[in-house]
C-alpha cells in the first residue's frame, strides 16, 4: 500500500511541478522593472522568455515578441532550451508514469515492467526539475549581473544636460514559479524512484526447510514453481513458497512466521 501511495503522490507532485514549469516558461514576468529608488513611472516594463511587455498607467498592456533568433543573447537562448528540454522530458515522464502506476492495469503487464517504467519516469522527472531550476537560476544570475551593471552607470550623461535613465530589471514572478515547480518535479521524481524499489520484488532465495516425516528419510522442499517477477528480465525459475491468496503488496513483503508450517 505504501508503494502505491508513494508512486501516486510522486506522480501528482510531478504533474503539478511540470504544469508549473510550463506556466513559468509561458509567463511574461521573468524580469520586472525595478521600482525601488527609481523615478515614478507611468509605464511599467516587464520581460519574458518570448516577449517584452509594457503596462501603461492608462490601463493598457502592450507586448512585443522577440522576432529575431540570432540577435538574442546566448544566455536567453540557453534558458529557453533548458526550459523546453525540461518540459519535453517532464511530459514524456508523465506519459510513462501513467502506464507505470500500480493502480492502473494494462493487459498483463508485470510488476518488473512497471518498476522499470517507474524508475524511467522518476529519472526523467529529476532531470526535468534540474533543467527548470538550472534555467531559472541562469536567468536570475543574468538579471543580477545586469542589475549591478546598470546601477553602476545608472545615469549616463549625454551632452551634459540630458540624462538617459536605464531601466533596471529585477526578479519577476516567473522565476519563483519556476524554482518551486522545478523543486516539485525533482521531489516527484525522487518519490517515483523510491516507489520503484518497492515495486521490484525481493529476489530472496529461501533456504530449504527439512521436514522429517516419520518412517521416511527424505527432505521436502515445499512450494511449486513460480515465474520470477524480479527487476529486469529473469528467465530462471526460482522455487519460492506460495503462501496462498494474498494482496499484491503482501506478495512483496518478507517472509513472516506464518510462511512456514
Amino acid at each position: 500500500m505504501a508503494v502505491t501511495a508513494c508512486q501516486g503522490l510522486g506522480f501528482v507532485v510531478s504533474l503539478i511541478g511540470i504544469a508549473g514549469i510550463i506556466a513559468a516558461t509561458c509567463m511574461d514576468q521573468w524580469s520586472t522593472q525595478d521600482l525601488y529608488n527609481n523615478p515614478v513611472t507611468a509605464v511599467f516594463n516587464y520581460q519574458g522568455l518570448w516577449r517584452s511587455c509594457v503596462r501603461e498607467s492608462s490601463g493598457f498592456t502592450e507586448c512585443r515578441g522577440y522576432f529575431t533568433l540570432l540577435g538574442l543573447p546566448a544566455m536567453l537562448q540557453a534558458v529557453r532550451a533548458l526550459m523546453i528540454v525540461g518540459i519535453v522530458l517532464g511530459a514524456i515522464g508523465l506519459l510513462v508514469s501513467i502506464f507505470a502506476l500500480k493502480c492502473i492495469r494494462i493487459g498483463s503487464m508485470e510488476d518488473s515492467a512497471k518498476a522499470n517504467m517507474t524508475l524511467t519516469s522518476g529519472i526523467m522527472f529529476i532531470v526535468s526539475g534540474l533543467c527548470a531550476i538550472a534555467g531559472v537560476s541562469v536567468f536570475a544570475n543574468m538579471l543580477v549581473t545586469n542589475f549591478w551593471m546598470s546601477t553602476a552607470n545608472m545615469y549616463t550623461g549625454m551632452g551634459g544636460m540630458v540624462q538617459t535613465v536605464q531601466t533596471r530589471y529585477t526578479f519577476g514572478a516567473a522565476l519563483f514559479v519556476g524554482w518551486v515547480a522545478g523543486g516539485l518535479t525533482l521531489i516527484g521524481g525522487v518519490m517515483m524512484c523510491i516507489a520503484c524499489r518497492g515495486l521490484a520484488p525481493e529476489e530472496t532465495n529461501y533456504k530449504a526447510v527439512s521436514y522429517h516425516a516419520s518412517g521416511h528419510s527424505v527432505a521436502y522442499k515445499p512450494g511449486g514453481f513460480k515465474a520470477s517477477t524480479g527487476f529486469g528480465s529473469n528467465t530462471k525459475n526460482k522455487k519460492i513458497y506460495d503462501g496462498g491468496a494474498r494482496t499484491e503488496d503482501e506478495v512483496q513483503s518478507y517472509p513472516s512466521k506464518h510462511d512456514y508450517v
Epitope: A42, F44, Q47, S58, E62, C63, R64
Partner: antibody, heavy 117, light 113 residues
Framework: EVQLVESGGGLVQPGGSLRLSCAGS????????MSWVRQAPGKGLEWVSS???????YYLDSVKGRFTISRDNAKNTLYLQMSSLRAEDTAVYYC???????????WGQGTLVTVSS | DIVMTQSPDSLAVSLGERATINCKSS????????????LTWYQQKPGQPPKKLIY???TRESGVPDRFSGSGSGTDFTLTISSLQAEDLAVYYC?????????FGQGTKLEIK
C-alpha cells in the same frame, strides 16, 4: 458621443476650498485612467493629478497634500477636491481621459478657478 | 522632474509651406518593453481644450490629417506639418507620458507669415 463636462469652478479666497466635478457621458469613467490638467491664463498646460486602476493616485508636487482626486462610479463622475488654495492655483481646469500611450485623448471644455482676495 | 523644452517659442510659416516644431526631453522617453517613445503632441486653438494629434511620438490619432507627422526617439522629437493650412494656426504642445509628474513643453505658437 463621448463628453466630459467640468463644473464647480468659481472665485475663491486664498486658503479656501473648492470641489471640481467632471461628469462623463458616453463613457464609463471608472474603466479608464483619468487626469486633471490646468492652464493658467495666457500660460501653458500643466498636469495636476491622475487616478488609475485600483484607485492609485498621482499628484503634482506643488498640490500634494492640498488636492485630492477621486471618483464616484455610481454617478460616473470624477472629482478634484482643492483646499488651501493659493493665487498660483488660478487656472482653467480640464479633466481628460488617459488612453493609449498614456496620452490624453478626450478633454472637457474646462472650468475656471480664480483664487483672489 | 522631466523638463520638456520646445523650440521655437513661435513660428511664422507661409500657407502651403512646411512647419517643423522640436521638442527635447531631459530624459529618454523610450520604453524598453515595447520600444515606444512616450511622447504626445497636442494642438490647442484659442478658447478650446487641447486636441491630441500624435501619440507614441509617431502614431497619428485617427481623424488627424496626414499632413501632421511625428518623429524622433529617446530625447529628441519633431512635429512636422508638411503643408500648412489656415486651420493649423494654433499653439502646439509636446508632453512626456513616461514619468510622473507628466510634463508639457512650454508650447510653440504657429502663425502665418
Amino acid at each position: 458621443e463621448v463628453q466630459l463636462v467640468e463644473s464647480g469652478g468659481g472665485l475663491v479666497q486664498p486658503g479656501g476650498s473648492l470641489r471640481l466635478s467632471c461628469a462623463g457621458s458616453g463613457i464609463t469613467l471608472s474603466t479608464y485612467a483619468m487626469s486633471w490638467v490646468r492652464q493658467a491664463p495666457g500660460k501653458g498646460l500643466e498636469w495636476v493629478s491622475s487616478i488609475i486602476s485600483g484607485g492609485i493616485t498621482y499628484y503634482l508636487d506643488s498640490v500634494k497634500g492640498r488636492f485630492t482626486i477621486s471618483r464616484d462610479n455610481a454617478k460616473n463622475t470624477l472629482y478634484l477636491q482643492m483646499s488651501s488654495l493659493r493665487a498660483e492655483d488660478t487656472a482653467v481646469y480640464y479633466c481628460a481621459r488617459k488612453y493609449h500611450g498614456n496620452a490624453l485623448d478626450y478633454w472637457g471644455q474646462g472650468t475656471l478657478v480664480t483664487v483672489s482676495s | 522632474d522631466i523638463v520638456m523644452t520646445q523650440s521655437p517659442d513661435s513660428l511664422a510659416v507661409s500657407l502651403g509651406e512646411r512647419a517643423t516644431i522640436n521638442c527635447k526631453s531631459s530624459q529618454s522617453l523610450l520604453s524598453s518593453g515595447n520600444q515606444r517613445n512616450y511622447l504626445t503632441w497636442y494642438q490647442q486653438k484659442p478658447g478650446q481644450p487641447p486636441k491630441k494629434l500624435i501619440y507614441w511620438a509617431s502614431t497619428r490619432e485617427s481623424g488627424v490629417p496626414d499632413r501632421f507627422s511625428g518623429s524622433g526617439s529617446g530625447t529628441d522629437f519633431t512635429l512636422t506639418i508638411s503643408s500648412l493650412q489656415a486651420e493649423d494656426l494654433a499653439v502646439y504642445y509636446c508632453q512626456q507620458n513616461y514619468f510622473y509628474p507628466l510634463t508639457f513643453g512650454q508650447g510653440t505658437k504657429l502663425e502665418i507669415k
